[in-house]
């Protein structure tokens, strides 16, 4: 048996940061389970992972490069992405499993979500008449 | 090349309070999440604290909380350990460790500083 | 919190010989398991990441297998500068954890 993941197909980072929410088919209140972010189509890069245990706040561990945080509500995980690069732009697996009680059980591959992080622009000053010259 | 050195060792009576320093080289220290593993003399590796680039997330084992901080200077490369109430069972040598390319594995590790509790 | 259990504690062996040594978790820990070398006096190294990963600059012939709760590390034909103590680590669940280690010894 294996959970489904629901997850936006496409999300904008303009301000260099962006939320990603994990909406899974299974109720997480009261279990020990592990929730983790991945980068690149092969998923090969573990971006972040949130701990959740019943007995204890949320435990969120950030990969080299990556600032992030994370939400739990009882059918999702709210991915916090920060100070993201251009060059992160890419597409993003949500993955969840249910460490404990047993059975162990974790997700069917999502569709992902391409996180487009736009460049941080200057804003070009506004236009208006200088001093005259002469 | 990478190194990580730690520092403020020593012996302290039970109760007691002891600092301990790593000093980072080779590597952007702001970007990496640092963590300190001790060691009972004769025993196993024992994770103790933890600590995210910017301080936002601190975790500690449950054998030190309210007891241990950590910290991180990153302007000065440097993690630290603030031991309180020390006890007994504190007795190890203290490993400063670097998070892994994989979340929550640790490499490298540095040379270890002994931290004795006793009377 | 999970429980890691090495076998056998102490391991003698000649060069040359191939190593075989077991961690078993408390429960699943999916593949999330590393294992370290740590030699007399040394801090402890990164061998392998999750269950199965050679971490940068690690020879051949060091080999991880296994998942869930059953996992093998494997030196295929021991060199002298392999005896050491070796330790499992998960990070499967909170909080990460240590096995107490298997003593590879020159028989």
């Known amino acids: 048996n294996k959970i489904l993941v629901k997850q936006s197909p496409m999300l904008v980072a303009y301000d260099n940061a962006v939320n990603l929410s994990c909406k899974y088919s299974y109720n997480l209140f009261s279990r020990e389970f592990r929730a983790s972010l991945h980068k690149g189509l092969d998923s090969a890069v573990e971006v972040c992972v949130v701990y959740g245990n019943y007995s204890q706040q949320l435990q969120v561990y950030s990969k080299t490069g990556f600032n992030c945080d994370g939400k739990l509500g009882n059918e999702s995980v709210t991915f916090y992405l920060q100070n993201l690069y251009v060059n992160q732009t890419d597409i993003y697996f949500c993955k969840i499993e249910v460490m404990y009680p047993p059975p162990y059980l974790d997700n069917e591959k999502s569709n992902g979500t391409i996180i487009h992080v736009k460049g941080k622009h200057l804003c070009p000053s506004p236009l208006f008449p200088g001093p005259s010259k002469p | 090349e990478v190194q990580l050195v730690e520092s403020g060792g020593g012996l302290v009576k039970p109760g007691g309070s002891l600092r301990l320093s790593c000093a980072a080289s080779?590597?952007?220290?702001?970007?990496?999440?640092m963590n300190w593993v001790r060691q009972a003399p004769g025993k196993g590796l024992e994770w103790v604290s933890s600590?995210?680039?910017?301080?936002?997330?601190?975790y500690y084992a449950d054998s030190v909380k309210g007891r241990f901080t950590i910290s991180r200077d990153n302007a000065k490369n440097s993690l630290y350990l603030q031991m309180n109430s020390l006890r007994a069972d504190d007795t190890a040598v203290y490993y400063c460790?670097?998070?892994?390319?994989?979340?929550?594995?640790?490499?490298?590790w540095g040379q270890g500083t002994l931290v004795t509790v006793s009377s | 919190e999970i429980v890691l259990t090495q076998s056998p504690a102490t391991l003698s062996l000649s060069p040359g010989e191939r190593a075989t040594l077991s961690c078993r978790a408390s429960?699943?820990?999916?593949?999330?398991l590393a294992w370290y070398q740590q030699k007399p006096g040394q801090a402890p190294r990164l061998l392998i990441y999750?269950?199965?990963n050679r971490a940068t600059g690690i020879p051949a012939r060091f080999s991880g297998s296994g998942s869930g709760t059953d996992f093998t590390l494997t030196i295929s034909s021991l060199e002298p500068e392999d005896f050491a103590v070796y330790y499992c680590?998960?990070?499967?669940?909170?909080?990460?954890?240590f096995g107490q280690g298997t003593k590879v010894e020159i028989k």
């Open positions: 460790a670097r998070e892994g390319n994989i979340v929550l594995t640790f490499d490298p």
């Open positions: 080779g590597f952007t220290f702001s970007t990496y999440t």
């Open positions: 600590i995210s680039t910017s301080s936002s997330h601190i």
């Open positions: 429960q699943s820990v999916s593949s999330y």
């Open positions: 999750d269950a199965s």
């Open positions: 680590q998960q990070r499967g669940y909170w909080p990460p954890t």
